[in-house]
């Protein structure tokens, strides 16, 4: 027989020879870091077929690291489900707790003994410091000094000294989250007031109000013979500007060769950026109709809008 087989877990006792005679036996021992558990054989014989009789290293078991219990409020999860050397132990904490120490320990061989690469971590309760104070506002539980996981606070704005109220910009409620960090930035309290939206040759049809504060929503329609350039719905944003900008109502010109068609009220097209106050001054561009299949409107090929007048 030629050289005997090699194994991961066991090694030949003595030096291997280039050739072995029929009937000759070789013995193995468990390698460093492995230990023998009977009764499986750890030897083989060169048989008359000039092959070695079957043998395996299943009798040699890896050294295992000491058992680690789950940390309080967490879990120790052995990778591959084993404590044997060469493998890892992963640690995770329950919701509301965070890890102090190493997230992964390695089962390592020191001499012939398997030991863990470090101390098991611990799981500490997630705690948050008080959330930020905000100008012109306050939050609930302002007297509490330590907040636990998922504890929530809600912000509100103070009464304003002037005629216009403070608006709360952002989410009013935040909670103590993972890593002892609040779930989002604190909101802000400020006066948000949009200007009165003026549309020439059109008018407001909903969202009427004395003043237009944060998130006020207004809708418009154009007079007969005019179409809406921009969005028919605008919202007062946190910068005290209308978003999208206040639209304009532009004149629809009838086809030059026919009498003017009957016109429906207004047609909304995609939003475009315009000045907040509709302006009748400045250059007057040529406009093409933005729509084609609305009742009473000329199709683009039937006539063009060459003026605002």
């Amino acid at each position: 027989c030629e050289e005997p087989p090699t194994f991961e877990a066991m090694e030949l006792i003595g030096k291997p020879k280039p050739y072995y005679e029929i009937g000759e036996r070789v013995d193995y021992k468990c390698k460093k870091g492995y230990f023998y558990i009977p009764p499986l054989a750890t030897h083989t014989i060169c048989d008359r077929n000039h092959t070695w009789l079957p043998v395996s290293d299943d009798a040699c078991y890896r050294e295992t690291c000491p058992y680690i219990r789950d940390p309080l409020n967490g879990q120790a999860v052995p990778a591959n489900g084993t404590y044997e050397f060469g493998y890892q132990m992963h640690f995770i904490c329950n919701e509301g707790y965070y890890l102090i120490g190493e997230e992964i320990l390695y089962c390592e061989l020191k001499g012939s003994v398997a030991i863990w690469s470090g101390k098991p971590p611990i799981c500490e309760k997630v705690l948050c410091t008080p959330p930020p104070k905000i100008k012109n506002g306050k939050h609930t539980f302002s007297e509490v000094e330590v907040f636990e996981y998922l504890d929530a606070v809600t912000y509100s704005c103070d009464p304003a000294p002037g005629p216009d109220p403070f608006s709360l910009i952002g989410e009013s409620t935040i909670y103590c989250g993972d890593n002892s960090v609040w779930s989002r930035a604190a909101p802000e309290c400020k006066v948000v007031k949009c200007r009165f939206p003026v549309v020439e040759n059109g008018k407001q049809i909903s969202g009427f109000g004395k003043k237009f504060y944060y998130k006020a929503t207004v809708m418009f329609e154009c007079d007969k013979g005019f179409y809406l350039d921009g969005s028919d719905t605008i919202v007062c944003d946190s910068n005290s500007t209308w978003d999208p900008p206040v639209p304009k109502c532009l004149k629809v010109l009838p086809p030059s060769s026919t009498k003017p068609p009957a016109l429906s009220h207004s047609v909304s097209t995609s939003s475009t950026t315009k000045s907040p106050a509709s302006s009748a001054s400045g250059p007057r561009p040529t406009y093409k109709p933005p729509v084609s299949n609305y009742p009473g409107y000329p199709k683009p090929e039937e006539g063009i809008l060459d003026s605002l007048d």
């Epitope: 200007r195 000045s275 106050a277």
Partner: antibody, heavy 118, light 107 residues
Framework: QVQLQESGPGLVKPSETLSLTCTVS????????ISWIRQPPGKGLEWIGV???????NYNSAFMSRVTISVDTSKNQFSLKLSSVTAADTAVYYC????????????WGQGTLVTVSS | DIQMTQSPSSLSASVGDRVTITCRAS??????LNWYQQKPGKAPKLLIY???SLHSGVPSRFSGSGSGTDFTLTISSLQPEDFATYYC?????????FGGGTKLEIK
């Protein structure tokens, strides 16, 4: 307290251009929206137009082809120009501040009488 | 344009009277209506904006109401300084238009 003061010639000949200024004291013209309003003798009020802080203007269509409202920030003044005047344009002309971007007129000048006559 | 019609065009009343002036719009204007007071030889003064909101410094005897097309200005107890001409003004639609005025005279 912001004050508005209209000024200009009290007499304008027919077909000429009426030019008035509105001087702002106690504030900057760049932060005010200003309207011009007129009142013929013994009659009611008539809105002429407005100029907004962004420079945009809106005019009463009754005057559209002959009115211009502008601002001169260096002089802290607004101006009204009305061309091709007739006797029907004889009136007291007021400039009035649009309140905080909303179309109510909270602060008015004292008004200036313009007579159109040859 | 939206026409604003005031009634009556003139009215005689005594000090202490309760007075109501009406203003009618030719189409719905929501609450977009203001009231002004004008004394002879003077510029108008804003009394009420957005139908019922009192402008700063205006006495509480003045009040406004209405919605849509019909509006009223009420003076609960007339004072000597209240004798003047009153104008309504709409601002839902350009051009912003005024009523013809109501002249309030001493009886």
């Amino acid at each position: 307290q912001v004050q508005l003061q209209e000024s200009g010639p009290g007499l304008v000949k027919p077909s000429e251009t009426l030019s008035l200024t509105c001087t702002v004291s106690g504030g900057s013209v760049s932060s005010y929206d200003i309207s011009w309003i007129r009142q013929p003798p013994g009659k009611g009020l008539e809105w002429i137009g407005v100029i907004w802080t962004d420079g945009g203007t809106n005019y009463n269509s009754a005057f559209m082809s002959r009115v211009t409202i502008s601002v001169d920030t260096s002089k802290n003044q607004f101006s009204l120009k009305l061309s091709s005047v007739t006797a029907a344009d004889t009136a007291v002309y007021y400039c009035a501040r649009v309140y905080d971007g909303y179309p109510w007129f909270a602060y008015w000048g004292q008004g200036t009488l313009v007579t159109v006559s040859s | 344009d939206i026409q604003m019609t005031q009634s009556p065009s003139s009215l005689s009343a005594s000090v202490g009277d309760r007075v109501t002036i009406t203003c009618r719009a030719s189409q719905g204007i929501s609450n977009y209506l203001n009231w002004y007071q004008q004394k002879p030889g003077k510029a108008p003064k804003l009394l009420i904006y957005y139908t019922s909101s009192l402008h700063s410094g205006v006495p509480s005897r003045f009040s406004g109401s209405g919605s849509g097309t019909d509006f009223t200005l009420t003076i609960s107890s007339l004072q000597p300084e209240d004798f003047a001409t009153y104008y309504c003004q709409q601002y839902i639609k350009l051009p912003w238009t005024f009523g013809g005025g109501t002249k309030l005279e001493i009886k």
